[in-house]
Interface confidence: low
């Protein structure tokens, strides 16, 4: 069985049940896709599209479906037991120390290096330097020379919300 | 035209198990459904077993038989399949299996029905 | 678990009767986010039940007007405006949304 859905993750008004509401049919917890009840007797489903709860839990309320942002792309709709899934639009990615945003992927690598990986929903172009090989990501100089490149396919969520 | 086709009838012994399928048609099996289970002892109601959700495996139980019965599902054939293990005469009924949409909990296709006849 | 009592438990009618059953939960079935998880369901002689009415007053598609349902909280009803021979069978009522989902103990929809 997975592990309890802790306090932290939680929104405010979704707090965790107290000890004594665990009396519900599977030792005092509920399985994915619904919440206690608040009598701690009865597991409810959580509603289709609007909340979720992905472990076995004594949560009072499930957790309410991420709506993806403008900018994104839902991947995957949010399930009774899975939230939804969001991407960057094509041409963007999410950079793992700012993933509240898609940022824009750069059009093509600076003078003196060359394109060796395309944008993805989860990383900008990468460039090496010509001669070294170095790799080089992320904020650059203002570009003097551009390669152009098409965005890559998407493989995979860059961003998996809750 | 969505379908619920089950195994054919069991004659089983006291004590024996025995695994009963469920083979779905006309609609994505791992669809955001449920695929319960519901017991129907000869002239009485009818009882939920269980449930299993295909797209991730994710099972529910009635305390009632939890211990007896294992859900489990083959996403490749669209099938799933309940299994009962130490079956006494108490487990002779029709088995149904039904699909419930997960964010309404109503059954709107079920199975052909398996009847179990556990005997000696 | 959640009690789910029906009345009557059997129903003699004749063809064109209106037709009445009672479903009485133990406690109320509200869920949380205000929804009404009852559901009804015919069971004809030698078939698989079949769903008639979903949360409460929901037709299902395909079933005809003259069975609605009604009630709130712990008391619901199914009703049948002129009862034809296809009606015949034993109808269940249904509370979903809490584990485990409970079926009434059915009412049996007979000729006199």
């Known amino acids: 069985e997975s592990a309890l859905i802790t306090q932290q993750d939680l929104a405010p008004q979704q707090r965790a049940a107290p000890q004594q509401k665990r009396s519900s049919p599977s030792e005092g917890l509920c399985p994915p896709g619904h919440h206690i009840s608040e009598d701690g007797r009865d597991c409810i489903s959580c509603k289709y599209g609007q909340d979720y709860s992905t472990h076995w839990n004594d949560l009072l309320f499930c957790l309410r479906c991420t709506r993806c942002d403008s900018g994104e792309v839902e991947l995957s709709p949010c399930t009774t037991t899975r939230n939804t899934v969001c991407q960057c639009e094509e041409g963007t990615f999410r950079e793992e120390d700012s993933p509240e945003m898609c940022r824009k992927c750069r059009t093509g690598c600076p003078r003196g290096m060359v394109k060796v990986g395309d944008c993805t929903p989860w990383s900008d172009i990468e460039c090496v330097h010509k001669e070294s090989g170095t790799k080089h990501s992320g904020e650059v100089p203002a570009v003097e020379e551009t390669v152009t490149s098409s965005p890559g396919t998407p493989a995979s969520p860059c961003s998996l919300s809750g | 035209e969505v379908q619920l086709q089950q195994s054919g009838p069991e004659l089983v012994k006291p004590g024996a198990s025995v695994k009963i399928s469920c083979k779905a048609s006309?609609?994505?099996?791992?669809?955001?459904?449920?695929l319960n289970w519901v017991k129907q002892s000869h002239g009485k109601s009818l009882e939920w077993i269980g449930y299993i959700y295909p797209n991730n495996g994710d099972t529910s139980y009635n305390q009632k038989f939890k211990g007896k019965t294992t859900l489990t599902v083959d996403k490749s054939s669209s099938t799933a399949y309940m299994e009962f293990r130490s079956l006494t005469s108490e487990d002779s009924a029709v088995y149904y299996c039904t699909r419930g949409s997960n964010w309404i909990w109503y059954f709107d296709v079920w199975g052909t029905g398996t009847t179990v006849t556990v005997s000696s | 678990d959640v009690l789910m009592t029906q009345t009557p438990l059997s129903l003699p009618v004749s063809l064109g009767d209106q037709a009445s059953i009672s479903c009485r939960s133990s406690?109320?079935?509200?869920?949380?986010?205000?929804?009404?998880?009852l559901d009804w369901y015919l069971q004809k002689p030698g078939q698989s039940p079949k769903l008639l009415i979903y949360k409460v007053s929901n037709r299902f598609s395909g079933v005809p007007d003259r069975f609605s349902g009604s009630g709130s909280g712990t008391d619901f009803t199914l009703k049948i405006s002129r009862v034809v021979a296809e009606d015949l069978g034993v109808y269940y009522c249904?509370?979903?949304?809490?584990?485990?989902?409970?079926f009434g103990a059915g009412t049996k929809l007979e000729l006199k």
């Open positions: 406690q109320s079935i509200v869920h949380s986010n205000g929804d009404t998880y």
């Open positions: 006309g609609y994505t099996f791992t669809d955001y459904y449920y």
């Open positions: 249904f509370r979903g949304s809490h584990i485990p989902p409970t």
